[in-house]
Structures are given as C-alpha cells and as structure tokens.
C-alpha cells in the first residue's frame, strides 16, 4: 500500500519569526565544538532596507518518503514563496495602481540558509527502519536576478561577505543544495 | 555536480602553520557541509573536523582542539583549513569532502585532490 | 572519544564473498550513526561506497552491499573482483562528531 504524502494548509510566517522543529537532543558532545564555531547568520539586505523588500516563508508539514518508506512523523519544511523586490513602484498612468520597472532587476525569494533534521524512517513489509538526515529550508532571502544574466546568475541583495567561523549560531543554521527547492516545489 | 579543487603541496618547519584551500565549483559553499579528513603516509584516514548542519556549528575533532581553525570566504566559494604548531607527525596528505547537496544529507560525497604538508626541520 | 574497529587484512578470492565489519568502542552500531563505507586505491583519494548503513550511489558497484550485522556496521562483496582490491575504511557519526575506522586492506587473490 503506496504511502500518502500529508500536508496541512500553508501557513504565512513573517521572516525571520518563524519556528522551527528542534532536532532532537543527540549525545551530550559539546566538547569538540568550536569555541567560535558557527556560521554568522546572513542578513541579505541592511535593517534600514528590510520593510521596502518582501519574502514570504511558508511552512508545510508532511511525511517523508525515501523509496517504500516513511518518516515516523510528519516534518515541518519551509517554502521560499512568491516574488520579492522594491516596494518603491514605478505609478503607472492611473497613478494608483504599482508596477515592476520593465528593465529592472528581478527579485527571487529563495532559500537562503538549511539546516539538517534527523528523520527516521518506517519502512513496509518488516524491513529495518532507516535513519536519514533531511535537508530543509531554514530561512528565505531575496536575490537579485538581473535580466540580461544567465538564470543561474542570481545575485545577493546586499553585500556577501566572507564568512569565517565566528560567533556561535543559533539554530536554524545551516543551509543546502539548490536541487532542494525544487523538490519542495514538486512536492507540493 | 560538485568539484573541489585544492591548493598545491607545502614544505613547512615545525612550529609553523599552514593554511590549505579547497575552492568550490558546481555548487556554492554556503550549500554545503565541508569537511577536513588527513591520511599521514602509509596510515589511515582521520577526520579532522567539518560543518554539521543539525547545529550550523563547526566541529573540529577533539585532538586537534586548538591547533585547527576552519573558515569559508564565500565571496570565493572557497574553504580553509589552517593548522598551527606543526610537528613532524602532522606531515599527510590533506582532503576537503563535501556532501551532494541531495535532499537527504549525504556527507563526504565528493573529495578533493589532496594537498600533502610536509613538516620537516 | 569513541574507538572505531576493523579487520586489519582479508583475502578473497575472485568471485568470492567477503564481509568486513565496523564497530564501535562506545557499543552496538546502529542506524543512527549512520555507517559510511569509503573504498581507497593507492595514490587515488578515497571515494564513498555506501551512506547511511546502506545507502548505496551512482558509481557504487551493485555486488557490494551495507547492513548491520551483529551490533556491527558491514560491507558485503559478493563476486569479488581483482579491481576490488583496495584499502575500506568505514565511519561513524557521533552526533556531529565522525571517526574513521583504522582500515581494511582487501586482498583479492
């Protein structure tokens, strides 16, 4: 019997305020941790800028499947959803109604850091159970995508700086592959 | 697919530090879980610690607690691993690995070439 | 830290099946240490065979298999091949933290 992916209806979540399911506590092991070990958050445009730009984070809460098998429990996952960029339109003749520039950039709302969920799986017909660690979405920003680039050009909004291991991370904090957010999209 | 390219080999003193690098293509770094394992001539392969993304921390393996820092220049897609205090017996060959940034974490995935230091007086 | 163990040395012969294993100085592995299994030939960087006690990839050849076999983590060659001569190295996550195993130098004669 074929397992059915389950889902509840999405729910907006203002970025950045959203909760995330805890992984659960693994072995007590914070000896070999770096003392500045984490990943700086990321903040894709300057606090000044953050009203002006819009990325909405949607959160959908499924079972996972791999092959036959299927997660013991449902997983919260995260969808980067919808357009984002200037909230200074351009009036168009009416002078009520707000539209893209034309030759502007185009804005994507995409993953921006992933984070890593111990899931174990049941699998059918008395086969062992599995243990995966699932990559999900743990925070969406804005990109810039400028028209004449080629589509995997995308652009940060707002300076990328380098990033070394300083100041520790709070969870979420980490972040994935670019195959994932079309499966999320896929799944849906 | 995700390629890791390496800096070439070092001849260092003890004492000294080195600092090796493990440049990205196919993926950008902050996509993926790096990590740093070394094999000493003739021995087996040691993990030296990586980024576990359930905690988004850097863990180094407690042995090399305080001689190994790991950074990442995103601007680059490129990642270091530099280890300080050399002694002789830190001469091996030095190998980023990277998971394939699939839906399921699959660490180690993809390795680099390889970077030999050489310590020695 | 934890110790991880395996065979120093095994031989089989071509067509043969051998099993090596990889335990766990901390106690029984299990699915939540999630056993990866490397192959490595001399001069050559190590390349993974299986993820996730048994996950096997793309360029994982179909006559080798992972399981979990008597509180151990194992690889199964079954209808070994001279090319399967090479050094296997297994290792554990201990909650973030991995360890190799010391090796196991695969004879196939």
């Known amino acids: 019997q074929g397992w059915q992916a389950f889902r509840n209806d999405a729910t907006e979540v203002i970025p950045g305020l959203g909760e995330y399911p805890e992984p659960p506590p693994e072995n007590n092991q914070t000896m070999n941790r770096a003392e500045n070990g984490g990943r700086p958050p990321h903040h894709p445009y300057d606090a000044k800028d953050v009203s002006e730009y819009s990325c909405r984070e949607l959160h959908y809460t499924r079972f996972l499947t791999d092959g036959p098998c299927r997660s013991a429990k449902p997983v919260t996952e995260l969808v980067c959803s919808g357009q984002c960029g200037p909230a200074r339109l351009l009036p168009n003749a009416i002078g009520r109604v707000k539209w893209w520039r034309p030759n502007g950039p185009d804005f994507r709302c995409i993953p921006d850091r992933y984070r890593a969920q111990r899931v174990q799986l049941l699998c059918p017909g008395g086969a062992a159970p599995r243990s995966r660690k699932v990559r999900l979405v743990a925070s969406c920003k804005c990109k810039r995508l400028t028209r004449f680039h080629n589509q995997s050009e995308l652009k940060d909004f707002g300076p990328e700086t380098a990033r070394p291991q300083k100041g520790r991370k709070p969870r979420p904090g980490a972040r994935g592959a670019k195959a994932n957010q079309a499966e999320l999209e896929n799944a849906y | 697919e995700v390629q890791l390219v390496q800096s070439g080999a070092e001849v260092k003193k003890p004492g000294a530090s080195v600092k090796v690098s493990c440049k990205v293509s196919g993926y950008t770094l902050t996509e993926l879980s790096m990590h740093w394992v070394r094999q000493a001539p003739g021995k087996g392969l040691e993990w030296m610690g990586g980024?576990?993304?359930?905690?988004?921390?850097?863990i180094y393996a407690q042995k090399f607690q305080g001689r190994v820092t790991m950074t990442e220049d995103t601007s680059t897609d490129t990642a270091y691993m530099e280890l300080s205090s050399l002694r002789s017996e830190d001469t091996a060959v030095y190998y980023c690995?990277?998971?394939?940034?699939?839906?399921?974490?699959?660490?180690?995935?993809?390795w680099g070439q390889g970077t030999l230091v050489t310590v020695s007086s | 830290q934890a110790v991880v163990t395996q065979e120093p040395s095994l031989t089989v012969s071509p067509g043969g099946t051998v099993t090596l294993t990889c335990g766990s100085s901390?106690?029984?592995?299990?699915?939540?240490?999630?056993p990866y299994w490397f192959q490595q030939k001399p001069g050559q960087a190590p390349r993974t065979l299986i993820s996730?006690?048994?996950d096997k990839h793309s360029w994982t050849p179909a006559r080798f298999s992972g399981s979990l076999l008597g509180g151990k983590a194992a690889l199964t060659l079954s209808g070994a091949q001279p090319e399967d001569e090479a050094e296997y190295y297994c290792?554990?996550?201990?909650?973030?933290?991995?360890?190799f195993g010391g090796g196991t130098k695969l004879t196939v004669l």
């Open positions: 996730d006690t048994d």
């Open positions: 690995a990277t998971d394939s940034a699939g839906y399921w974490y699959k660490f180690f995935q993809h």
């Open positions: 290792l554990l996550d201990y909650g973030g933290t991995f360890v």
């Open positions: 901390t106690g029984a592995v299990t699915i939540d240490h999630y």
């Open positions: 980024f576990d993304p359930e905690d988004g921390e850097t």
